[in-house]
Interface confidence: low
C-alpha cells in the first residue's frame, strides 16, 4: 500500500518516541564515530521534518524515500571525510547505491573505547537529572558498537534498562539491586547482537534462500502443529523484517515486526499453544517473548516421512514441479519431527536430500537411486552428537576457564594467523557452550550447542573479513553457511605456519593486573596463552599447562607482595626464562 509520504506513514505507525529512538539507532549504526550530541541534533531535525509531513503529506520533500531523507541528513555532517575517510565518497552516489555504500562501511569492530561503568550513585544522578538523555545515550552507545543490533529488540533492552534504574535508584542498596540487572542486560545484549549478526550475514553473504531455509527449519521446530502454509507465511514475513533491519531500514523493520507479532497473536490457534502468555504482553515484550517462545508439543500422529519423500513414485515429478517448495516441505516435515536436532544439521540433511534428488532424478531408475537416501543421514547426525558428547565430558572434567583454555590452544593451532584478541574473544565464547548447553538433557543439547557455535563462529568470520589473514578461515567462512562448524572442527594444526618471533614484552606484566576483575585477569592469562602457542605451535598440552600453572602462581605471589611492581619485574624475568627453557624457545 503506497503512501504519499513514507516518513509520515512511519511516524504515525510507530509514534514519536519509537520513531526518534529508531532514527537515533540507525544514524549511530551508520556513523559510529560521531559524537552523541551531533546525532541527537540530526535526529531532532529529522523528527521536526517528519511532523511537518504528518501535518501535510504534500509538503516539500515529504514524498522522498527514507533512504534519501536519512542519507541526505547524514551527508550534512561536516567532519565526514576527516572522521570516516573513504566513507565520505558514499555521499557522491545516488540512492540506492548510497545506502549500499553506507552499509558496506559498517564496522563490526569499531575503534571505540571500552564502556566503563560509572559508580552507581553517579549513574542514578544522571538518570534522575535527565532521564531522556540518559536513555538516548544507552541506545547510542550500544548501536554504534553493534552496528547490526536488531533495532526493535534494542528498544526492548532500553525499556528494561529504564525499568532497572527506575526501581534500583530508589532502593536501599542501589548497587545490590542495579549491578546484577546491568550485568544481565550486558550479557543478553551481547548474545542478542551476535545472533542478529548471523542473520544479517546469512542474508547478505548467502542470500534470501539461505535465510528462508533457516527460518523454515527453526519455525517448524517451534510450531510443529502449524500447517506448512502457515509456516511459509511466517517465514516470508520474518524474512522481510530481517532483510529490512539488516539493510538499515529500521522504521520499516520495527513496523513490520509489530504487524507480524499482531498476526501471530491473532492466529495463535493455527500456530502454537505456547503463545498465550506472550500475546498478553505489551508490544516490545510480546515480540521478544514470541521470538524466544519454547517449542510446542509435536503432534502425536505424524506419519513416517518415507512415504512422501522416498517411497512415493512421484518424488521426482513433485521435485521438478516446484523444487524449493518441495524441499521446503521436506525441511518442514523433518524439522517438526526433530526438535532434538540443531537447525544447521536439519539444513545439512535437506542439502543432502536435494543433492541426491538432483543426481537421481536424472538417472535411469530414479527410485532405485534415491531409495537409500535416509541412510546417508546417519553419519551427518552422529558427527555433531559425538562431538558434543566429547566436549561436554571435557567441560565437566575441566570447568569453564580451563575448557576455554583447551579451545584457545586448539583454535590457535588451527588458525595461528588470526589476531590474538580475536582468538581470545572467540575461544572464550566457544567455551561458554559448556555452561550454556551441557546441563541440558540429550534431547536439547544439540540444538543448544551447535546453533550457538554457529553464532560464535560467525563472529570469527565477520571479524576476520575486516582484515583477512588466513585462507583457512576464509574458506570455512565462505564455502557453506551450514558447514562452517564442521569445517573448523576438521582443521588440523596449520603446518605451514612460521612461529612468531619471541618478544619478552608480550610476557611482561605489571601490578595493575592485581586490581583487575577475575574476568579481566583471565583474559590477560588467556592472551599470554595464545601468544605462547603462536611462539611454540608444537608445544604439548603438558608443557603449556606447566607454563600456565607457573604463570598463575607468579601472579598470585606478586599480588600478595609488599612491593608488587618490583616483584613483577624480577620474578617476571625468571618466569620468562623458565618458560623459554620449558618450551625450548
Amino acid at each position: 500500500d503506497a503512501h504519499k509520504s513514507e516518513v509520515a506513514h512511519r511516524f504515525k505507525d510507530l509514534g514519536e518516541e519509537n520513531f526518534k529512538a529508531l532514527v537515533l539507532i540507525a544514524f549511530a549504526q551508520y556513523l559510529q564515530q560521531c559524537p552523541f550530541e551531533d546525532h541527537v541534533k540530526l535526529v531532532n531535525e529529522v523528527t521536526e521534518f517528519a511532523k511537518t509531513c504528518v501535518a501535510d503529506e504534500s509538503a516539500e520533500n515529504c514524498d522522498k524515500s527514507l533512504h534519501t531523507l536519512f542519507g541526505d541528513k547524514l551527508c550534512t555532517v561536516a567532519t565526514l571525510r576527516e572522521t570516516y575517510g573513504e566513507m565520505a565518497d558514499c555521499c557522491a552516489k545516488q540512492e540506492p547505491e548510497r545506502n549500499e555504500c553506507f552499509l558496506q562501511h559498517k564496522d563490526d569492530n569499531p575503534n571505540l573505547p571500552r564502556l566503563v561503568r560509572p559508580e552507581v550513585d553517579v549513574m542514578c544522578t544522571a538518570f534522575h537529572d535527565n532521564e531522556e538523555t540518559f536513555l538516548k545515550k544507552y541506545l547510542y552507545e550500544i548501536a554504534r558498537r553493534h552496528p547490526y543490533f536488531y533495532a526493535p529488540e534494542l528498544l526492548f533492552f532500553a525499556k528494561r534498562y529504564k525499568a532497572a534504574f527506575t526501581e534500583c535508584c530508589q532502593a536501599a542498596d542501589k548497587a545490590a539491586c542495579l549491578l546484577p540487572k546491568l550485568d544481565e542486560l550486558r550479557d543478553e545484549g551481547k548474545a542478542s547482537s551476535a545472533k542478529q549478526r548471523l542473520k544479517c550475514a546469512s542474508l547478505q553473504k548467502f542470500g534470501e534462500r539461505a535465510f528462508k531455509a533457516w527460518a523454515v527449519a527453526r519455525l517448524s521446530q517451534r510450531f510443529p502443529k502449524a500447517e506448512f502454509a502457515e509456516v511459509s507465511k511466517l517465514v516470508t514475513d520474518l524474512t522481510k523484517v530481517h532483510t529490512e533491519c539488516c539493510h538499515g531500514d529500521l522504521l520499516e523493520c520495527a513496523d513490520d515486526r509489530a504487524d507480524l507479532a499482531k498476526y501471530i497473536c491473532e492466529n495463535q490457534d493455527s500456530i502454537s499453544s505456547k503463545l498465550k502468555e506472550c500475546c498478553e504482553k505489551p508490544l516490545l515484550e510480546k515480540s521478544h517473548c514470541i521470538a524466544e517462545v519454547e517449542n510446542d508439543e509435536m503432534p502425536a500422529d505424524l506419519p513416517s516421512l518415507a512415504a512422501d519423500f522416498v517411497e512415493s513414485k512421484d518424488v521426482c515429478k513433485n521435485y521438478a514441479e516446484a523444487k524449493d517448495v518441495f524441499l521446503g516441505m521436506f525441511l518442514y516435515e523433518y524439522a517438526r519431527r526433530h526438535p532434538d536436532y540443531s537447525v544447521v544439521l536439519l539444513l545439512r540433511l535437506a542439502k543432502t536430500y536435494e543433492t541426491t534428488l538432483e543426481k537421481c532424478c536424472a538417472a535411469a531408475d530414479p527410485h532405485e537411486c534415491y531409495a537409500k537416501v535416509f541412510d546417508e543421514f546417519k553419519p551427518l547426525v552422529e558427527e555433531p552428537q559425538n562431538l558434543i558428547k566429547q566436549n561436554c565430558e571435557l567441560f565437566e572434567q575441566l570447568g569453564e576457564y580451563k575448557f576455554q583454555n583447551a579451545l584457545l590452544v586448539r583454535y590457535t593451532k588451527k588458525v595461528p594467523q588470526v589476531s590474538t584478541p580475536t582468538l581470545v574473544e572467540v575461544s572464550r565464547n566457544l567455551g561458554k557452550v559448556g555452561s550454556k548447553c551441557c546441563k541440558h538433557p540429550e534431547a536439547k543439547r544439540m540444538p543448544c550447542a551447535e546453533d550457538y557455535l554457529s553464532v560464535v563462529l560467525n563472529q570469527l568470520c565477520v571479524l576476520h573479513e575486516k582484515t583477512p589473514v588466513s585462507d583457512r578461515v576464509t574458506k570455512c567462512c565462505t564455502e557453506s553457511l551450514v558447514n562452517r562448524r564442521p569445517c573448523f572442527s576438521a582443521l588440523e594444526v596449520d603446518e605451514t605456519y612460521v612461529p612468531k618471533e619471541f618478544n619478552a614484552e608480550t610476557f611482561t606484566f605489571h601490578a595493575d593486573i592485581c586490581t583487575l576483575s577475575e574476568k579481566e585477569r583471565q583474559i590477560k592469562k588467556q592472551t599470554a596463552l595464545v601468544e605462547l602457542v603462536k611462539h611454540k605451535p608444537k608445544a604439548t598440552k603438558e608443557q603449556l599447562k606447566a607454563v600456565m600453572d607457573d604463570f598463575a602462581a607468579f601472579v598470585e605471589k606478586c599480588c600478595k607482595a609488599d612491593d608488587k611492581e618490583t616483584c613483577f619485574a624480577e620474578e617476571g624475568k625468571k618466569l620468562v626464562a623458565a618458560s623459554q627453557a620449558a618450551l625450548g624457545l
Epitope: 502457515e230 492466529n267 493455527s270 512422501d308 512421484d314 513433485n318 521435485y319 516441505m329
Partner: nanobody, 115 residues
C-alpha cells in the same frame, strides 16, 4: 508461495447440501495428504476429514461420517468436500489444510445451516 483458497460455502437449510472446493497452488499438491478442518464461533478448530495423496484412503470425524465425502483432483490441484444432510451444528468456518492437522493456513469459507 503456498496458497489454499476455499470456496463453495453459503447459507443452507437443515437437510440441504453444499460442495466445498479448495484450490491449491505453490506446492506439489499430488504429494501430500489433505484435510478439512472447521471452526465454529467461539470454539477451537475441529478436524473433519482427511484424504491421502493418491485419493484412495479417506478418513472422517465421527460427527460427519456417512454425510460428508472428501475427494480430490490432483490434475486440477483441487480438494473437495461434499456435504449432505447438513445440520445446524455443522455451522462453522471451513478450512482446507495440508497434511492431517487442525491448524488453519488459509482464509476459509463460511457454512451456515439455519432454517
Amino acid at each position: 508461495e503456498v496458497q489454499l483458497v476455499e470456496s463453495g460455502g453459503g447459507l443452507v437449510q437443515p437437510g440441504g447440501s453444499l460442495r466445498l472446493s479448495c484450490a491449491a497452488s505453490g506446492f506439489t499438491f499430488g504429494s501430500f495428504g489433505m484435510s478439512w478442518v472447521r471452526q465454529a464461533p467461539g470454539k477451537g478448530p475441529e478436524w473433519v476429514s482427511a484424504i491421502d495423496s493418491g485419493g484412495a484412503d479417506t478418513r472422517y470425524a465421527e460427527s460427519v461420517k456417512g454425510r460428508f465425502t472428501i475427494s480430490r483432483d490432483n490434475a486440477k490441484k483441487t480438494l473437495y468436500l461434499q456435504m449432505n444432510n447438513l445440520k445446524p451444528e455443522d455451522t462453522a468456518m471451513y478450512y482446507c489444510t495440508i497434511g492431517r492437522s487442525t491448524s488453519r493456513g488459509s482464509q476459509g469459507t463460511q457454512v451456515t445451516v439455519s432454517s
